[in-house]
């Protein structure tokens, strides 16, 4: 009996530009002889329904139809037909099919590959055209994929140390698509510093599918109005 097992759940998520290994494990009732078996990997794009051959291994020869694609002969010996794709790109997301032939048997499995890109976040202060005691703080998130993103603003005061979400005077602009397929977005917070307590900490909080934990950038309102800090935590998907 010949069986193929792919990633549990049927979906693999990988960061943009990563060297991804798409899992495919072979279960066979006898020891595998790699000189008398064949492995073919196929890819079907999210945008068009045509299947394309990515890699082929048979007997004493292997061929990559996508540059750098490889199945390890040394791992194949122990039943691992996983496909390594170096430098994965957004457009390579889609359905991957692993087809194994141990004559006369054939088995196959499919997996969905999602490629994500983590946002970079930075805070900017824009005082151009603002009234006295009024500041506009901009939280720029760039280079993320997919498009769905959630940006919120929070504040912590000495009186209320737990973060409170700010809903007023927040404007989040439209997402803009970059040439490389990733997205950018800017969220603005308008503050009247005369009405806020010095020492109040404001945070821009970015949530995205590529992040295990939200990306937080903060600034502290001082008597001298403001003090922008570096992005506190960048926890990219890995």
């Amino acid at each position: 009996d010949l069986k193929v097992e792919m990633m549990a759940g049927g979906t693999q998520i990988t960061p943009l530009n990563d060297n991804v290994t798409i899992f495919c494990n072979i279960f066979y009732s006898q020891p595998l002889n790699i000189t008398s078996m064949g492995i073919t990997w196929f890819w079907k794009s999210l945008t068009f329904d045509k299947e394309v051959k990515v890699f082929e291994f048979f007997g004493d020869h292997q061929e990559a139809f996508r540059p750098g694609a490889i199945v390890s002969p040394w791992r194949l010996k122990s039943g691992d037909a996983s496909l390594r794709l170096p430098g994965i790109q957004l457009e390579e997301a889609g359905e991957y099919r692993c087809e194994v032939v141990v004559t006369p048997l054939k088995a196959q499995g499919t997996v969905q590959l999602e490629v994500v890109a983590s946002p970079a976040s930075r805070l900017l202060l824009d005082q151009v055209g603002m009234k006295e005691n009024e500041d506009k703080y901009m939280c720029e998130s760039s280079g993320f994929y997919p498009e769905a993103i959630n940006i919120t603003w929070e504040k912590q005061t000495q009186k209320f140390p737990h973060p409170i979400e700010i809903s007023e005077d927040v404007i989040t602009g439209p997402t803009i698509k970059n040439m490389d397929g990733t997205f950018n977005v800017t969220s603005c917070l308008k503050l009247n510093s005369s009405q806020e307590d010095p020492g109040t900490v404001y945070q821009c909080v970015v949530r995205h599918a590529s992040l295990h934990t939200p990306l937080r950038s903060n600034f502290t309102l001082t008597a001298a109005r403001h003090s922008l800090s570096e992005t506190e935590k960048t926890d990219n998907f890995s």
Epitope: R75, S78, R84
Partner: antibody, heavy 120, light 111 residues
Framework: EVQLVQSGAEVKKPGASVKVSCKAS????????MDWVRQAPGQGLEWIGD????????LYNQKFRGRVTLTVDTSISTAYMELSRLRSDDTAVYYC?????????????WGQGTTVTVSS | DIVLTQTPLSLSVTPGQPASISCKAS??????????MNWYLQKPGQPPQLLIY???TLHSGIPDRFSGSGSGTDFTLKISRVEAEDVGVYYC?????????FGQGTKLEIK
């Protein structure tokens, strides 16, 4: 920085078993196989086998089959080599080595070695 | 099993002079256009370190005075100018077939 840190020296009696650990850091553990190689005093290198942390698949040198068991715990990036029914000629330094498997096959980083002495 | 025979088993070289070690395999270690022959150096009291893989590719961090050549069954490791730090035992290893096997080693000493 890639590092492989092995467990300490062991002294065992003939017939006993020994389990050597190899803690990996500085790279993605599942991207490479782990080779095990031994070296008897004053002798050359002898390949014991390897394990694929991706699926736990193992390949053993026929000479050790039935006596050696290679395992991994991916949650702590650690590989293990257990050798049973020890004999005096199993006295050797045992090495784990990270093994590239996609673009060739070679051991590019090695542990410091674990000395196993089998003596009655 | 593929048997690897290294020659010479020992050599003594003056610093600055070249050195050459041969490794002959009992059968071809080529597969799909590549040669699966690796070279390691084991310095006294240390684990082996990779020098050359795939017959001729220099491992990162290894000085370019080391070079490897050959295909099929005949392989050579060359050191263009031996330095004092090159002392130790040199091993060839094939990784085409299991069990992966090593040569018996060549001991390099400095004159």
């Amino acid at each position: 920085e890639v590092q492989l840190v092995q467990s300490g020296a062991e002294v065992k009696k003939p017939g006993a078993s020994v389990k050597v650990s190899c803690k990996a850091s500085g790279y993605t553990f599942t991207d490479y196989n782990m080779d095990w190689v031994r070296q008897a005093p004053g002798q050359g290198l002898e390949w014991i086998g390897d394990i694929n942390p991706n699926n736990g698949g193992t390949l053993y040198n026929q000479k050790f089959r039935g006596r050696v068991t290679l395992t991994v715990d991916t949650s702590i990036s650690t590989a293990y080599m257990e050798l049973s029914r020890l004999r005096s000629d199993d006295t050797a330094v045992y090495y784990c080595a990270r093994s590239e498997v996609f673009y060739g096959n070679y051991a590019d980083y090695w542990g410091q070695g674990t000395t196993v002495t089998v003596s009655s | 099993d593929i048997v690897l025979t290294q020659t010479p088993l020992s050599l003594s070289v003056t610093p600055g002079q070249p050195a050459s070690i041969s490794c002959k395999a009992s059968q071809s270690v080529d597969y799909d256009g590549d040669s699966y022959m690796n070279w390691y150096l084991q310095k006294p009291g240390q684990p082996p370190q990779l020098l050359i893989y795939a017959a001729s590719t220099l491992h990162s961090g290894i000085p370019d005075r080391f070079s490897g050549s050959g295909s099929g069954t005949d392989f050579t490791l060359k050191i263009s100018r031996v330095e004092a730090e090159d002392v130790g035992v040199y091993y060839c290893q094939q990784s085409k077939e299991d069990p992966r096997t090593f040569g018996q080693g060549t001991k390099l000493e400095i004159k």
